[in-house]
């Protein structure tokens, strides 16, 4: 059980207040984290509260401002990047968001040696992506879908690609589907370790069907937004990888990296690129049917100026029970010999663990093992491997950082974080300096988050970087809900849940229950993290019990649970939410006439199907930006879990798993359907089709659209959304306003 430490004495209760919706919407109780911007083994940059860019040297204890807030303000900079030779800084302004990761901006180069902005050969605007080389001060940038190179900031740009075209050919940046579902970055170019070569992807979207939607704006006529967006079964982008010598880019030009024959024989994806040395690169490819992944190690052949990817350096990863990898196929972390690597994949028992691959995957040496999962490899040094896992005390929703000594035999394992601040901190991530000389730990909870700096050799804490004192003080007179994380054992399935209980919770009383669900494949909702959010308010002020349940399809508990939903989305995720609700009712403190469910995105899909399950368990529910049919969602994501919507593959389940097919079943529930009209991700089409089916079935429901809002429903829409949902739930639960 994880209980928030109680600071409440009865005599103080009258000074305590419940959370208000206003607190949540104003972000009154938001927390800060501190991630050092490492620039060497012992130095990092950080933007101070007054917006100066400060360089800290851990070993000397000295700090100095390398860039003043005055310089930042002179170009309205919101971000910066120091060149590795420390001669220049790029300043980023005019940020303009595109999709989840992508944005355009204006860039200015500031010369630290003379304290002036670089004049002459200024960068064009707006730029889609810009980065320094890892050594020196070369610049690569993407402008109008083409890649440019500068040897020095004041030099003229060298144009690397010429075929870039809006919505057609993307060089060095991903198209929509690669950005959202494969790379999870705004860039698709990678410098080699010393900046000798630049690798980049070219995405050809020429044949991809386009999603078009209206953007209403303020003009007399709405604009039409067009995005090449492959839905399940549609034509996909064609990807090619090129590498160019950045010292002499003109002599040979970009050289294409060959695709492994077993991948190239049918539709495929490129999934990631990892440089090993300046003359060795590792590419990962994936078949369109995403259960086969190939890792290909390629070497530069100087005599032919080409990249050679011998079959002997191809490593195949295949899943027989589901798809390859977790959410994504894991990426390798190479060791110092520049050929062997560490990688997370399923062991023979179906748990994702770290393996060491020296020659073939078949001969891989398993580094971690157990009925838990290794989640991320942070760093490999000459003698240590740092990783995170959920091993400690068998709580899947925790994250601790471990160190394995790889220099000694047998390798010894040490949990770096398990006992540091055990009550406060059970969910960590880490950020390492060069050679792991130092590292920062960022603890996300369950207590108030705290960021600390540590010695990479001894693991000793050096200093606290951020402890959120102001937040701690602000929460002193707030009646926070209690939280507990427990598990249900049902038919050989373990269902972990988090329950958020009103501050004066009394097991002998009856409370309305709200289920918050996401439930997407390889997701995890039950995590030991701190949050003061909308559901905290609903428990604190409105006296609701809120529960989050990780059912089949969720992550970090082994492949049996994860791959249970393979090829049949929308079945077990819903069943497990329903099963959990029945168990909660059995606990005796739930008012079974007042149970609701809500979710966003995949959670909107699950909440809709749960409401339409015909169980009679739910009085009402909310779906925000739900998927309604897998035929409407992106190919890369959907086909990973569902296969293709073709007769000879999985069309039948595509049809059976729609929300529309269950329209009749909404008759006996109160349903609130919400969607942004400019949702580039889960298209408004999804909710439009639900609404049409409900109207055709003559089923009453409530709906709210948010004009020109995307999948995130941000800004003022957020306030309106949560206010609207609060009213809906209070009405459903007969709570007074």
């Amino acid at each position: 059980i994880v209980l928030r430490p109680s600071r409440v004495h009865n005599s103080e209760e009258n000074t305590m207040r419940a959370l208000t919706l206003k607190d949540i919407l104003n972000g009154t109780f938001s927390y800060k984290t501190f991630f050092p911007n490492w620039i060497s083994g012992q130095e990092y940059l950080h933007q101070s509260a007054d917006n100066n860019i400060v360089l800290y040297n851990i070993e000397t204890g000295q700090s100095y401002t390398i860039l003043s807030n005055r310089t930042m303000k002179s170009v309205n900079a919101s971000n910066y990047g120091l060149s590795p030779d420390r001669q220049f800084v790029y300043l980023e302004s005019d940020y303009s968001k595109l999709w989840r990761y992508s944005y355009t901006a204006t860039y200015y180069i500031y010369d630290l040696s003379n304290g002036e902005f670089v004049r002459g050969n200024e960068l064009p605007r707006p730029i889609q992506y810009l980065c320094w080389s890892p050594v020196g001060s070369k610049l690569a940038y993407v402008y109008q879908n083409n890649i440019y190179l500068k040897q020095r900031p004041g030099d003229p740009p060298f144009q690397i690609t010429f075929n870039g075209r809006e919505n057609k050919i993307f060089n060095g940046i991903p198209d929509w589907v690669y950005e959202e579902e494969m790379l999870a970055t705004k860039y698709a170019l990678w410098w080699s370790p010393n900046g000798k070569f630049l690798a980049y992807a070219e995405f050809n979207d020429t044949d991809i069907p386009v999603i078009a939607y209206s953007y209403y704006g303020d003009e007399q006529y709405p604009r039409t937004i067009n995005i090449p967006y492959p839905k399940a079964g549609a034509k996909n982008p064609v990807v090619r990888i090129f590498i160019i010598d950045t010292t002499y880019p003109a002599y040979v030009g970009p050289q294409e990296v060959p695709v492994p024959a077993m991948i190239a024989s049918s539709d495929y994806y490129f999934s990631w690129l990892t440089w090993v040395t300046d003359e060795r690169v590792c590419l990962q490819w994936l078949k369109r049917v995403q259960n086969v992944s190939v890792l290909s190690i390629c070497d530069f052949r100087e005599d032919w100026q080409t990249w050679d990817c011998p079959k002997t350096q191809e490593h195949i990863e295949e899943s027989r029970t589901g798809w390859a990898g977790g959410f994504f196929v894991s990426t390798p972390v190479f060791s110092y010999d520049a050929i062997s690597y560490y990688k997370i994949f399923s062991d023979k028992d179906g748990y994702k663990h770290i393996h060491y691959i020296k020659d073939t995957v078949e001969n891989a040496i398993q580094i971690t093992s157990g009925k838990w999962e290794a989640i991320n490899i942070f760093r490999v040094t000459q003698d240590s491997l740092f990783y995170s896992s959920n091993e400690f005390e068998e709580y899947p929703g925790r994250r601790n950082i471990y160190r394995i000594s790889i220099g000694s035999y047998p390798p010894s394992k040490k949990c770096v974080t398990c006992h540091l601040r055990k009550e406060r901190c059970q969910y960590y991530t880490a950020s390492f300096s060069d050679y792991a000389k130092y590292y920062a730990l960022v603890c996300y909870g369950p207590g108030i988050p705290i960021s600390t700096l540590h010695d990479g050799r001894t693991d000793q804490e050096i200093k606290i970087l951020e402890e959120n004192k102001e937040l701690e003080n602000a929460l002193k007179n707030i009646q926070l809900p209690k939280e507990e994380i427990k598990k249900l054992e049902v038919d050989e399935i373990t269902l972990w849940y988090k329950m958020i209980l009103p501050p004066q919770f009394d097991r002998s009383k009856k409370y309305p229950l709200l289920i918050q669900v996401y439930g997407g494949p390889c997701s995890q909702s039950v995590r030991s993290v701190f949050a003061v959010n909308w559901i905290s308010y609903l428990a604190s002020k409105e006296g609701m019990v809120i529960a989050l349940v990780d059912g089949r399809g969720t992550a970090f508990q082994g492949d049996k649970l994860l791959y249970a939903v393979y090829r049949k989305l929308g079945v077990y995720e819903v069943e497990d939410q329903i099963t959990a609700v029945r168990k909660f009712i059995e606990m005796g403190f739930i008012d079974e006439k007042r149970i609701a469910i809500w979710g966003w995105s995949y959670g909107g899909y699950v909440s809709s199907l749960a409401l339409a399950s015909g169980t009679g368990l739910f009085k009402c529910g909310i779906a925000v930006a739900p998927v309604s049919s897998w035929e409407y969602y992106a190919s890369v994501y959907t086909e990973r879990f569902m296969g293709l919507p073709t007769k000879d593959d999985n069309l039948e389940h595509y049809k059976n798993s729609t929300v529309m097919a269950r329209a009749e079943y909404f008759r006996n529930v109160d349903y609130l359907l919400i969607h942004g009209t400019a949702d580039d991700n889960v298209h408004f089409q999804n909710s439009a089709q639900i609404a049409k089916a409900l109207v055709n079935a003559q089923v009453d429901f409530q709906a709210m659209w948010y004009s020109d809002q995307n999948h995130g429903l941000s800004g003022l829409s957020t306030n309106h959304l949560y206010t609207h949902m609060t009213h809906f739930l209070k009405q459903c639960f007969s709570l007074s306003d």
């Epitope: 050969n121 040897q151 030099d155 060298f158 144009q159 002499y248 003109a250 002599y251 100087e302």
Partner: antibody, heavy 120, light 103 residues
């Protein structure tokens, strides 16, 4: 001041080999990319080969690829061009040239040239 | 491969004249274009780099302009010592040369 001095030219029969040298002084040799450029009698300039400051990058004109090899010895401040399988159309004055700086592809300093004559 | 085409291949002008030589690239090369002067029996000499940057010691009557595919070398007031062959160059490619004679 910067000085580049080519040597090793002469008359050679077709199919034979020759090695040109270029001795550099007056600048930090190991910091600059170096090129060979040739000029056939009465003709224009033709770029032959380049080598980066540390020797890790080498490129050749198509006309000499597989026959000529560019190299450098930074400890001796010397650039080399090994020419094998020489042909009559390789007859030219060979210049070594230093980049103004890496990345702009301009040749700021040139040697005086050495004549290579390929003749039976 | 990028081709550079110079025009004219030769020209004759009088002292004091303004002279222009053009260089056209087969595809866009930003402003990575250099101009050289070569006198008989001598090594080439860099006049202008990056399309318009005059090298130190080069008389100010020489100027360069252009970007993309079309570039120009101009001599504002021709002097007797400007008689030479002029080459444009982009990395490993030279133009065929323009021979300038003084009338």
């Amino acid at each position: 001041q910067v000085q580049l001095l080519e040597s090793g030219g002469g008359v050679v029969q077709p199919g034979r080999s020759l090695r040109l040298s270029c001795a550099a002084s007056g600048f930090t040799f190991s910091s600059y990319g170096m090129h060979w450029v040739r000029q056939a009698p009465g003709k224009g300039l033709e770029w032959v080969a380049v080598i980066s400051y540390d020797g890790s990058n080498k490129y050749y004109a198509d006309s000499v690829k597989g026959r000529f090899t560019i190299s450098r010895d930074n400890s001796k401040n010397t650039l080399y061009l090994q020419m094998n399988s020489l042909r009559a159309d390789d007859t030219a004055v060979y210049y070594c040239a230093r980049e103004s700086y890496t990345g702009l592809g301009s040749f700021l300093h040139w040697g005086q040239g050495t004549l290579v004559t390929v003749s039976a | 491969n990028i081709q550079l085409t110079q025009s004219p291949s030769s020209l004759s002008a009088s002292v004091g004249d303004r002279v222009t030589i053009t260089c056209r690239a087969s595809q866009t090369i930003s402003n990575y274009l250099n101009w050289y002067q070569q006198k008989p029996g001598k090594a080439p000499k860099l006049l202008i780099s990056a399309a318009s940057s005059l090298q130190g010691g080069v008389p100010s009557r020489f100027s360069g302009s252009g970007s993309g595919t079309d570039f120009t070398l101009a001599i504002s007031s021709l002097q007797p010592e400007d008689s030479a062959t002029y080459y444009c160059q982009y990395w490993g490619t030279f133009g065929q040369g323009t021979k300038l004679e003084i009338k």
